[in-house]
């Protein structure tokens, strides 16, 4: 921690004579500049410079040539690194007076003259002195008005709204300052500070608007802080609503967007009277261009149970705004299809949600479906199929004679999705078939038996067994299954010299 | 041809309010292509922006002016009008009502620049 | 606020003669910077608008450069018409601001 700089000459104040010259020396353990009083037109009689010295100190001397009323004033030196805008410069001061019997009172910028008090709060009527001797009266419309006065700051006290004068008398000449107009303004010891942002997401060569408002208070300072910045991109504005309330509104817009434009945008709003302080922030993202991304929430191959309700959801960021479409086997899904329905729903600002329903699977419902995503920019696609899942069921079961070899081939004709297996079995007894335990199921090995299996379509399979020779009458079952179900048929294959007679149980 | 004409007191003492009305002709204050504003001129001060405002009632103003003034609009006459109160000495000036142009960028329309201006209207704060 | 300081204050030259005015902004403003002619007893009038742009109606004499914080306006030549106050005016920052002005005076 450094301490203070100091300053010679070692006093609070000083009288300097009217078209003097004095000099003020400042000595850190850091390097140290000076503040001083400058009028409107940055005063060329004040000229500062460094000067070595051995004592291992920093010295900065401050000169004034010709010195005038308007030299007078509060001088602080302070360390570099301390200064920052928004607090009282911490330092070691000075006052320097500059009596001159033609300038009474310190001249002052025009916004001097306006004077801002909160409710009943005090507040400093700025009119100094360049003589710390020189009495001074403070007049109202409704004459002398009795606060207490310090020549370094003015008048504080308690004022109502209205034009207020000082006066002096100098060797005899009298000396008033144009008025000083005080105002009451609305303010809040809280700031209500809100931000808004209709859109955080940008392409470029668009313009990107954010406004912050601020309710109740008309004191207040509002500091931009955004990418652009430092070229000075953006443009401010600040309008004025009065009515049912005070409410300021701030907007920052930056047209002709660039990539180099995505950061924080921040606004801080500081109340001028006191130190009040509200900051609001959003991430503004440019892109170079527009774009798409699909997330679908399921795989590309999907199953569904027949008479099932199903929705697959698909979630989408994309901007600007997209069309979205859903194909079946490449043609537009027809909207009045009371069955299979599609919506879209936005989450966020460049969140969708597309959802596609089945209503009750039907086995047209299988085929390849697409979500189209479009923009402006850019068109991505997802395309998965479905499957609507059939249990297994048979469709025919029949025998054929093979005439006078007296061999027959059943043939079993079954439909499922996926498409079933089919198994079959036989019973030799043909009086004891009733029992489960007398039905043997059919091996692929065995010699006088031939098995085999043919899909007709992605639905439909059929299963035929041959048996070279039939030599007594014996029955055989059809057992065609798939994940949702089996079923089963049986028949009667009779001996040919027992004059075959089909029966289908 | 667009035309803009002032009218109001040259003379306002201390204190008091200063009133000034703006009647434009050849053109409507209700277009969406513009702003309507006020600035003044004075050999202190130079050239300064006073307040503007936008059809749709918006109305834009100077925070050093914005606690003493009031800009209102009658569209039914095509005029806007200016009220300074409390005005001292330092508001004495060349007071101008002026037509803004505008930029529109797809989010809305924002200020441009001082495009037609009117012949000026000189006001003196004495006593 | 933007502080706009322009230079010279004055700039005393002949006709024919080639004029460069300069307005250097406290912050940068991008390009949103315009430029406006005034004579006696004139309202002022718009010459150059975003930096560059020639306002309607106005010769080509009339140039504007510049973005950011420093910004030019030229007049190649100068006819007689053209001995004014020149006034930059930014639109960036809020409020909008004007330069203190340039003179051009003939020699």
């Known amino acids: 921690q450094l301490s203070l700089p100091s300053i010679l000459p070692n006093e609070n104040e000083k009288v300097v004579q009217l078209n003097s010259s004095f000099s003020l020396r400042c000595f850190g353990e850091s390097e140290v500049s000076w503040h001083y009083p400058t009028s409107e037109e940055e005063n060329p009689n004040v000229e500062i410079r460094n000067e070595e010295n051995n004592s291992g100190l920093f010295v900065t001397v401050l000169e004034v040539v010709n010195a005038s009323a308007a030299h007078t004033g509060l001088y602080t030196c302070y360390y570099n690194h301390t200064q920052t805008d928004e607090n009282e410069i911490e330092g070691r001061h000075i006052y320097i007076y500059v009596p001159d019997p033609d300038v009474a009172f310190v001249p002052l910028g025009m916004t001097d003259y306006l004077v801002i008090v909160e409710d009943d709060d005090s507040a400093i009527i700025p009119c100094r002195t360049t003589d710390p001797e020189t009495p001074v009266t403070l007049l109202s419309n409704d004459g002398v008005v009795h606060a207490s006065y310090d020549s370094r700051q003015g008048f504080n006290g308690t004022f109502s709204v209205g034009p207020y004068i000082c006066e002096a008398t100098v060797r005899g000449k009298k000396f008033q300052t144009i008025p000083f107009n005080v105002y009451a303004l609305k303010a809040t010891s809280e700031l209500d500070l809100e931000m808004e942002a209709l859109k955080t997401v940008y392409k470029s060569g668009e313009t990107i608007v954010v406004t912050c408002a601020v309710f109740n208070n008309e004191v207040v300072d509002l500091q931009w802080t955004y990418p652009g910045e430092v070229k000075g991109k953006g443009i401010t504005m600040l309008e004025e609503i009065k009515v049912p309330s005070i409410k300021l509104v701030y907007t920052l817009r930056v047209p002709e967007a660039t990539v180099k434009d995505s950061g924080d945008y921040e606004c801080a709003a500081r109340q001028a009277t006191k130190e009040v302080k509200e900051m609001k922030k959003v991430t503004i993202s440019v892109h170079e261009k527009g774009f798409i991304e699909i997330k679908p929430n399921f795989s590309q191959l999907e199953a569904v149970d027949l008479h099932e309700v199903k929705h697959f959801v698909v979630d989408v960021q994309a901007y600007p705004p997209p069309r979205i479409s859903w194909l079946k086997d490449n043609l537009t899904l027809i909207e009045n299809l009371t069955e299979i329905t599609t919506d879209i729903e936005r989450t966020q600002e460049i969140r969708y949600r597309s959802k596609l329903k089945l209503i009750r699977a039907k086995e047209e419902d299988s085929g390849h479906y697409t979500i189209v995503v479009q923009n402006e920019d850019d068109v991505k696609s997802y395309t998965f199929e479905l499957l609507t899942q059939v249990p297994s069921s048979i469709l025919d079961l029949v025998d054929d004679h093979h005439g006078s070899t007296g061999g027959q081939t059943v043939r079993c004709i079954a439909e499922g999705t996926p498409l079933p297996d089919i198994e079959w079995m036989i019973c030799k007894d043909i009086k004891k078939c009733n029992n489960e335990t007398s039905w043997a199921i059919l091996a692929n090995n065995i010699s006088n038996i031939i098995t085999e299996v043919h899909p007709r379509d992605r639905s439909t399979v059929e299963g035929r067994v041959t048996f070279t020779r039939v030599e007594e009458t014996i029955a055989v079952r059809c057992l065609a299954k798939n994940l949702l179900g089996a079923e089963s048929r049986e028949l009667k294959l009779v001996a040919p010299t027992l004059r075959s007679e089909l029966t289908v149980a | 041809q667009l035309q803009l004409q002032e009218s109001g007191p040259g003379l306002v003492k201390p204190s008091e309010t200063l009133s000034l009305t703006c009647t434009v002709s050849?053109?409507?204050?209700?277009?969406?292509?513009y702003y309507w504003g006020w600035l003044r001129q004075s050999p202190g001060k130079g050239l300064e922006w006073i307040g503007s405002f936008f059809y749709t009632g918006s109305t834009y103003y100077n925070p050093s002016l914005r606690s003493r003034l009031t800009i209102s609009v009658d569209t039914s006459k095509n005029q806007f009008s200016l009220m300074l109160s409390s005005v001292t000495a330092a508001d004495t000036a060349v007071y101008y009502c002026?037509?803004?142009?505008?930029?529109?960028d797809g989010s809305g329309n924002y200020y441009g620049w001082f495009d037609r201006w009117d012949q000026g209207t000189l006001v003196t704060v004495s006593s | 606020e933007i502080v706009l300081t322009q230079s010279p204050a004055t700039l005393s030259l002949s006709p024919g003669e080639r004029a460069t005015l300069s307005c250097r902004a406290s912050?940068?403003?991008?390009?949103?910077l315009a430029w406006y002619q005034q004579k006696p007893g004139q309202a002022p009038r718009l010459l150059i608008y975003?930096?560059?742009n020639r306002a309607t109606g106005i010769p080509a004499r009339f140039s504007g450069s510049g973005s950011g914080t420093d910004f030019t306006l030229t007049i190649s030549s100068l006819e007689p018409e053209d001995f004014a106050v020149y006034y930059c005016q930014q639109r960036s920052n809020w409020p909008p601001a004007f330069g203190q002005g340039t003179k051009v005076e003939i020699k």
């Open positions: 050849g053109g409507s204050i209700q277009s969406s292509s």
């Open positions: 002026a037509r803004q142009s505008t930029y529109y």
């Open positions: 912050q940068a403003v991008s390009s949103y």
């Open positions: 975003d930096a560059s």
